[in-house]
């Protein structure tokens, strides 16, 4: 009879397990930037340090009455969700509270920045174990708040933020839109998106994953032994902050990139009903509900990948979209997607020493997305091989010519605007193993990687009949690194990865007039990491 | 995730000679002014002045002081509420929006963001 939210995120084998760092003491520290909190509550007493930090705006209204228990309500509840002895995720984790929200739950960007700087100063004055910062707040998009989060993340701090409760695109809010932050949406006991009055959880490509955020039981500031239920993306973010604290408690050296990849990899997949989200956001929103992952010792050297979507390019003729991986991750492939199907393809290029995934809109197109496949490949050495477009009627072949390099992804970019002229690109797994093959007017880009024990293979699935999409999945033990559409018809919307599934999308009109001989093929590159083996291409 | 969201960015490159000061004349504003797209969430009168990433500690203080001095010449009192050293170089200032053009032309300024509200979620 444990609360539903704890049952959901903590698998049975973890329930009784206490997470401790190797020396036996939990040295992870969570910083909570929120309202004031009631430190004497039985759930958090002795675990919480209430710092003297206070940077809040005045409350609105002349008749506003400051009632301590109301002022403390939001923060106390979240502190309880993170580290409460009996209803918390990371029971007993030490927590520091900074007051950046007033009694009405309002704060400022400047106050939040000063709070983040306070944490950085504390870190410099007294370096400690791993730090997790919980930001259960949201404002409009702020370049400086996102930049501050980026700077703090680069010092090794893990930031977890609420996606926002505006039933809107999380990318329009900060700190939710900061790429270096783990951004969390909210789901209910039925694993469905949380509705809050007329609004609800935010969604979109800036959300990393969802977590329980409806009717969450936690410490109530009304009394030192009281509990209450609260709902929101703050509660969801608090669950993930607790999970991260537990992960770091077991393995203090895990990096932000590793934590995010493991959270995504071990989350519960495909339980959220995506119809709740606006149609244009469904493909961008992750269908993931957080669970506490096992330790890396239990799961070995799995190849972990995630899909990163760019912002929409906009409809102008030369509009480009750019998707970036985190600094520690390898960009193993790049694809593109356009709802109108009018796109000029995708490619990988280096910007400021980092490989980025780019996609180009076509004339008359409504815009494109670039879709990056970002992976953790220990000791990887990756490079891009590209070949300019071939003359009319000729194929372009690109393969990985360096010794022990394997093909992890292909990209194709057409020089011509006229979509009817070009033949489509292809991947060939039989006649030319490990090659990207492009056709007329296509520049071809091959992502080639060398890493100990990395092996890859191509898996294709074609459908001749009418179908809006064709999918192909990598089997257990293999990870999807590349995803392309090899169309039979003239117009495809593009391809993208959803977890270990490669999805090739076809335009409605294209499928209507297709002949049975023109199969649309989804081509996946599936890789795995076997540290003892040599890098190899599997036929 | 790194592109600007639904966000207002205004270029305020006003005539650089307006002060009649030699060092100002040499510096045309390339910095931008940003503010929250949701008007109700804005806090006009409080601004975060963000300086270029490599700006040194002393230069941050000098820039804030320079803004105060130039504002005073025009009869404005501005209040530097906080100086940011550790996460990014910059400072928080309470001032009239009339002074934004002047502030954007200061050396080392990358952009200025109007303060805005954040809310418990």
């Amino acid at each position: 009879s444990i609360p539903w939210n704890l049952e959901r995120i903590i698998p049975a084998w973890h329930q009784t397990e206490e997470d401790r760092s190797p020396d036996g003491s939990s040295q992870v520290e969570v910083y909570l930037l929120d309202t004031s909190i009631q430190g004497a509550h039985r759930e958090i007493e002795g675990r919480v340090t209430i710092t003297d930090f206070n940077s809040v705006p005045e409350e609105d209204g002349t008749r506003f009455h400051r009632q301590a228990s109301k002022c403390d309500s939001h923060g106390t509840h979240l502190a309880g969700v993170v580290s409460g002895r009996d209803a918390g995720v990371a029971k007993g984790t030490s927590l520091h509270s900074l007051r950046v929200l007033n009694c009405q739950g309002k704060g400022t960007v400047s106050g939040t920045l000063i709070g983040l700087e306070f944490i950085r100063k504390s870190q410099l004055i007294q370096p400690s174990g791993p730090l997790v910062v919980l930001l259960p707040l949201a404002g409009g998009y702020s370049r400086i708040l996102n930049a501050a989060c980026r700077h703090l993340a680069r010092t090794g701090v893990v930031l977890v933020a609420a996606a926002g409760n505006f039933r809107d695109d999380a990318c329009l809010y900060s700190p939710a839109s900061a790429p270096e932050v783990i951004t969390v949406g909210a789901t209910n006991a039925q694993d469905q998106p949380v509705t809050l009055g007329t609004l609800g959880t935010n969604f979109g490509r800036c959300v990393d994953l969802f977590a329980p955020g409806k009717d969450i039981i936690g410490a109530s500031s009304d009394c030192s032994t009281c509990f209450m239920s609260q709902s929101g993306t703050s509660q969801a973010a608090a669950h993930v902050a607790g999970i991260v604290a537990r992960m770091l408690s077991r393995e203090p050296t895990l990096t932000l990139a590793e934590l995010r990849q493991r959270l995504i990899h071990f989350s519960t997949k495909d339980v959220i009903n995506m119809a709740w989200f606006p149609e244009d956001q469904q493909v961008l929103t992750p269908n993931l509900v957080a669970t506490l992952p096992p330790s890396t010792h239990e799961t070995g050297g799995q190849l972990l990948c995630r899909t990163v979507w760019s912002a929409h390019s906009g409809p102008t003729r030369t509009a480009t979209a750019t998707a970036r991986c985190a600094p520690e991750e390898e960009l193993l492939s790049c694809s593109s997607f356009s709802r109108s199907g009018r796109r000029r393809g995708d490619w990988i290029e280096a910007i400021g020493g980092q490989q980025v995934c780019k996609a180009l809109n076509a004339f008359g197109g409504e815009g494109v997305y670039a879709v990056a496949r970002c992976c953790l490949v220990p000791r990887a050495n990756c490079s891009i091989h590209n070949t300019p477009a071939a003359r009319a009627g000729l194929e372009t072949h690109v393969h990985c010519h360096q010794k022990d390099h394997v093909l992890t992804g292909c990209s194709f970019h057409w020089e011509v605007e006229d979509l009817s002229v070009r033949r489509q690109p292809a991947l060939r797994s039989r006649r030319q193993p490990g090659q990207c093959v492009g056709h007329q007017a296509a520049s071809v880009y091959a992502s080639c990687c060398h890493a100990p024990g990395l092996e890859c293979k191509i898996k294709e699935h074609g459908i001749s009949g009418p179908s809006e999409q064709v999918t192909v999945a990598c089997e257990a033990g293999w990870t999807l690194t590349g995803c392309n559409v090899l169309p039979g018809a003239s117009l495809t919307l593009g391809a993208y990865s959803v977890d270990n599934l490669c999805v090739a999308r076809v335009h409605d009109t294209a499928r209507a007039d297709r002949t049975s001989g023109e199969a649309t093929v989804a081509a996946a590159i599936c890789c795995r990491s076997r540290p003892s083996a040599k890098a190899s291409w599997v036929q | 995730q790194d592109e600007d969201g639904d966000y207002e960015e205004l270029m305020l490159a006003l005539p650089s000679q307006e002060d009649g000061l030699a060092d100002e004349a040499a510096h045309v504003a390339t910095a931008t002014f940003r503010r929250c797209s949701k008007e109700a969430w804005r806090l006009p009168g409080t601004y975060i002045v963000v300086l270029m990433e490599e700006t040194q500690r002393l230069q941050i203080e000098q820039t804030a002081h320079r803004l105060q001095t130039r504002a005073a010449r025009r009869g404005y009192v501005i209040k530097v509420l906080h100086i940011f050293y550790d996460l990014f170089p910059g400072f928080l200032v309470k001032m009239s929006s009339d002074l934004l053009g002047l502030a954007l032309k200061l050396p080392h300024v990358e952009y200025i963001e109007e303060d805005s509200f954040v809310f418990a979620q």
Partner: antibody, heavy 126, light 106 residues
Amino acid sequence: QLQLQESGPGLVKPSETLSLTCTVSGGSISSSSYYWGWIRQPPGKGLEWIGSIYYSGSTYYNPFLKSRVTISVDTSKNQFSLKLSSVTAADTAVYYCARENSGVVPAAGPNWFGPWGQGTLVTVSS
Amino acid sequence: EIVLTQSPATLSLSPGERATLSCRASQSVSSYLAWYQQKPGQAPRLLIYDASNRATGIPARFSGSGSGTDFTLTISSLEPEDFAVYYCQQRRNWFTFGGGTKVEIK
């Protein structure tokens, strides 16, 4: 229905440790719906809360007794225990064990005490 | 520590009469106050919780009121079995009990 029964020595010497056990029957001590508490009542006086424990082992003590109190739980035996060290005559009392609703599970209701054991008198005397 | 003061210490009434017991807190306990009944040689029994809610199986003649610092337990018409000691208890800040009010037969 749920019953609680205190057991332990009725006489303890000053400066020694008082040890009592409460056995729960008719229900599981491992429910997240409840805490399990100790309350005492010196002869002819009022009630004083000593402390409580959750099935997971997390403990909560009266700040005035904290330094001398240890409460533990044995879920396999459906029991929880009290140890009070360095006792004096002032610790002579009837000691009750009681269930306390936790509030962690809303259906359990707010955290008040009930049912109670019938109590056991412990006298501190040499 | 929140101190609860009960008055009167003793209340002498006859069966059928109305009993009014008072409990005052040294600081606000909101509505986080309960009333218990204890008979000689028995453990206390919960009567009222959160100031005014009757516990399961408690007769309607028992009622509680108040919030903040002043609370009242009322027994509308005393029955012979109601003669006992009554304690108030707060949970606003951990748990403390009042000194008790003895309701005795006049």
